[in-house]
């Protein structure tokens, strides 16, 4: 199509056109997590701010009860950063009797839930051992990729330890998705 | 709209269409930072290469004086990676008298400046404690997310310690944005 | 163009329009790497799953022999995450005779190959020293940015040590690109 004059009567496209401004989009930011009941054998899900500050949802992309609800089928770019902070982990101590310690770790998972599927699907995982020598440590895990989603799919962010999530600033921990 | 034949007389869109190729876009790459005066109480801003090698700006997205200038309102995906390198940090020493040391850290912030606002807005922050045992350490911090920006907004990348930024290669430290 | 009614006879665009759904896109996921011959003085390239599970290629974006083949010129967002895992590196041992050890490191490079160029171009690099105190360590390196690519360009992901790549789960190690 390079350099070719646009003419409505000679439209070289293979599917209906779509204005970019009306595509489903969301950027959610961290809020303090209140203690809640989590599913057994599943990392706890974070809940999010969806309208204050930098956070927004638009064009039928809705946030409800820890989930982003996908309003139409298509390819989405999905991303999240979670900043963790904690105290020195045990694995940084001198290893006793030559027996190496199992490292502590931090993990973020972006999960897709489809009502017709019994099991959630893990789309993205960032996992890191934490063996810091200093007393207080902090670090982010960033994830982002493109996935084909169906209308009605739900997205959430799960973390290995909800009490280590840095909830202090909206620019440190966030979650978003947009239709490509 | 799936599988439906496109016809100009039956255009199912809700806003004016826009060719993707003319959207504002930029990818900036690292250059060596020379000692300069920084604003008090603010992390120093990096300056960037905007036309050589992999770097480019296009479609009215301009780079000037450490800032990317947003030429039109809309939702932008903004990203940056900064690779830091340094020597062993003090917090990796044996903790004296049981008193834990405050860890050294590295931080990247993507900041938005709006002329009508007195204060810059921090859009994204990646911050990490550095307690390395080896002599030379190096590591990247990556950030990326979507934000609603207004025409005239300016974006910059600030870092906690400008002298630790790895400026040797354009693929290690970079900054970009594109209109969705 | 804000708020203006769309009319085919009054199309305010500067280039031919393009339906989003037919743009080249791919998301590739990790598979176990089989030992192969690598180019001298170049990090080994990973090979990928391109159709099972979360992986897909579409709209003429093809995967073949470790490469993503770019089917049309334009600006692409390219991303990858590689999760590494290994045993304690030597540099975490007590430094003998006051001589600091050279740190081990892990590196990911997204590389572009253009047939008319003799040398590959490194688009993105994430590199990190590894000086872990615990016995087993694991951590991801994430990269993503926008580049102007030409039809026929080929993309690959190279890593410093293929034997340290975590190939166990498709959400831990992945590679993707999409036309903007």
């Amino acid at each position: 199509l390079k350099g070719q004059e646009f003419a409505p009567s000679h439209q070289q496209v293979y599917a209906p056109l779509r204005a970019d401004g009306d595509k489903p989009r969301a950027h959610l930011t961290v809020v303090r997590q209140t203690p809640t009941q989590h599913f057994k054998n599943q990392f706890p899900a974070l809940h999010w701010e969806h309208e204050l500050g930098l956070a927004f949802t638009k064009n039928r992309m809705n946030y409800t009860n820890k989930f982003l609800l996908i309003p139409e089928s298509g390819d989405y770019f999905i991303y999240s950063q979670v900043t963790f902070r904690g105290m020195t982990s045990e694995c940084s101590e001198i290893r006793q009797a030559g027996r190496p310690n199992k490292p502590d770790s931090i993990t973020v998972v972006i999960t897709k839930v489809t009502d017709s599927y019994p099991e959630p699907t893990q789309l993205l995982m960032g996992t890191k051992s934490v063996c810091e020598v200093g007393s207080n440590w902090f670090q982010p895990i960033y994830l982002g990729a493109m996935f084909s989603l169906q209308e009605g799919d739900k997205l959430m962010v799960n973390v290995s330890d909800i009490s280590l999530v840095d909830y202090t600033k909206e620019d440190k921990t966030f979650f978003g998705a947009f239709l490509l | 709209l799936k599988g439906q034949e496109f016809a100009p007389s039956h255009q199912q869109v809700y806003a004016p269409l826009r060719a993707d190729g003319d959207k504002p876009r930029a990818h900036l790459t690292v250059v060596r930072q020379t000692p300069t005066q920084h604003f008090k109480n603010q992390f120093p801003a990096l300056h960037w290469e905007h036309e050589l090698g992999l770097a480019f700006t296009k479609n009215r997205m301009n780079y000037t004086n450490k800032f990317l200038l947003i030429p039109e309102s809309g939702d932008y995906f903004i990203y940056s990676q900064v690779t830091f390198r340094g020597m062993t940090s003090e917090c990796s020493e044996i903790r004296q008298a049981g008193r834990p040391n405050k860890p050294d850290s590295i931080t990247v912030v993507i900041t938005k400046v709006t002329d009508s606002y007195p204060e810059p807005t921090q859009l994204l922050m990646g911050t990490k404690s550095v307690c390395e045992v080896g002599s030379n350490w190096f590591q990247p911090i990556y950030l990326g997310a979507m934000f609603s920006l207004q025409e005239g907004d300016k974006l910059m990348v600030n870092v906690s310690d400008i002298s630790l930024v790895d400026y040797t290669k354009e693929d290690k430290t970079f900054f970009g944005a594109f209109l969705l | 163009l804000k708020g203006q009614e769309f009319a085919p006879s009054h199309q305010q665009v500067y280039a031919p329009l393009r339906a989003d759904g037919d743009k080249p896109r791919a998301h590739l996921t990790v598979v176990r790497q089989t030992p192969t011959q690598h180019f001298k003085n170049q990090f080994p390239a990973l090979h990928w799953e391109h159709e099972l599970g979360l992986a897909f290629t579409k709209n003429r974006m093809n995967y073949t022999n470790k490469f993503l083949l770019i089917p049309e010129s334009g600006d692409y967002f390219i991303y990858s995450q590689v999760t590494f895992r290994g045993m304690t590196s030597e540099c975490s041992e007590i430094r003998q005779a006051g001589r600091p050890n050279k740190p081990d490191s892990i590196t990911v490079v997204i590389t572009k190959v253009t047939d008319s160029y003799p040398e590959p171009t490194q688009l993105l690099m994430g590199t990190k020293s590894v000086c872990e105190v615990g016995s087993n360590w694991f951590q991801p390196i994430y990269l993503g940015a926008m580049f102007s690519l030409q039809e026929g360009d080929k993309l690959m992901v190279n890593v410093s040590d293929i034997s340290l790549v975590d190939y166990t789960k498709e959400d831990k190690t992945f590679f993707g690109a999409f036309l903007l």
């Epitope: - | 930072q33 000692p35 300069t36 005066q37 920084h38 310690d161 400008i162 002298s163 | 050279k102």
Partner: antibody
Framework: QVQLVQSGAEVKEPGASVKVSCKAS????????MHWVRQAPGQGLEWMGW????????NYAQQFQGRVTMTRDTSISTAYMELSRLTSDDTAVYYC???????????WGQGTMVTVSS | DIQMTQSPSSLSASVGDRVTITCRAS??????LNWYQQKPGKAPKFLIY???RLQSGVPSRFSGSGSGTDFTLSISSLQPEDFATYYC?????????FGPGTKLEIK
């Protein structure tokens, strides 16, 4: 513009100490590492060490360990290098230098000649 | 410590000549290699960083290349003001070390 202005020439006896100052202007003093490099007459360049003006942290070359002390006064944007137990081998021009990154030297002072002679 | 060697130690050339100076590190220093120019009685001047990237304000007749252990500094067409001593310096790890220098003289 960025400038480093060093103190004047010194003549010292063996066994004495010398303290050279380096006043910085035109940039944020605490944001960039300050290095000290010396050059004996007719010889090459020898890195002595650095100070991080923000934290006061230092890194000295092994051959100067125990003899050199680098300090700074952020209120007057000045770095200092003190070398003790001087011998005739320490006769040299001493430069302060600042880098945009910690591993290189963008801007140099004019140099301070230190002569050690009995 | 990383040792830096330079060759030649001195070099005679004429205005307009192309000259090349080599620098070798005793172990890999990646691209953390800098070049300086020094004239008699003056402080060194920073020329090239990251092995191949020209410092702002340095004429384009200067160029650098190399990675790992072997590096070169080239001057494409010598000008009268280029006659000086050139030093390489590794910034990979401390102690930072300089090469012994190459003295470029007028033939």
């Amino acid at each position: 513009q960025v400038q480093l202005v060093q103190s004047g020439a010194e003549v010292k006896e063996p066994g004495a100490s010398v303290k050279v100052s380096c006043k910085a202007s035109g940039y944020t003093f605490t944001a960039y590492y300050m290095h000290w490099v010396r050059q004996a007459p007719g010889q090459g360049l020898e890195w002595m060490g650095w100070i991080n003006p923000k934290s006061g942290g230092t890194n000295y070359a092994q051959q100067f360990q125990g003899r050199v002390t680098m300090t700074r006064d952020t209120s007057i944007s000045t770095a200092y290098m003190e070398l003790s137990r001087l011998t005739s081998d320490d006769t040299a021009v001493y430069y302060c230098a600042v880098g945009g990154s910690y591993d290189a030297f963008d801007i140099w002072g004019q140099g301070t000649m230190v002569t050690v002679s009995s | 410590d990383i040792q830096m060697t330079q060759s030649p130690s001195s070099l005679s050339a004429s205005v307009g000549d192309r000259v090349t100076i080599t620098c070798r590190a005793s172990q890999s220093i990646s691209s953390y290699l800098n070049w300086y120019q020094q004239k008699p009685g003056k402080a060194p001047k920073f020329l090239i960083y990251g092995a191949s990237r020209l410092q702002s304000g340095v004429p384009s007749r200067f160029s650098g290349s190399g990675s790992g252990t072997d590096f070169t500094l080239s001057i494409s067409s010598l000008q009268p003001e280029d006659f000086a001593t050139y030093y390489c310096q590794q910034g990979h790890s401390t102690p930072f070390t300089f090469g012994p220098g190459t003295k470029l003289e007028i033939k």
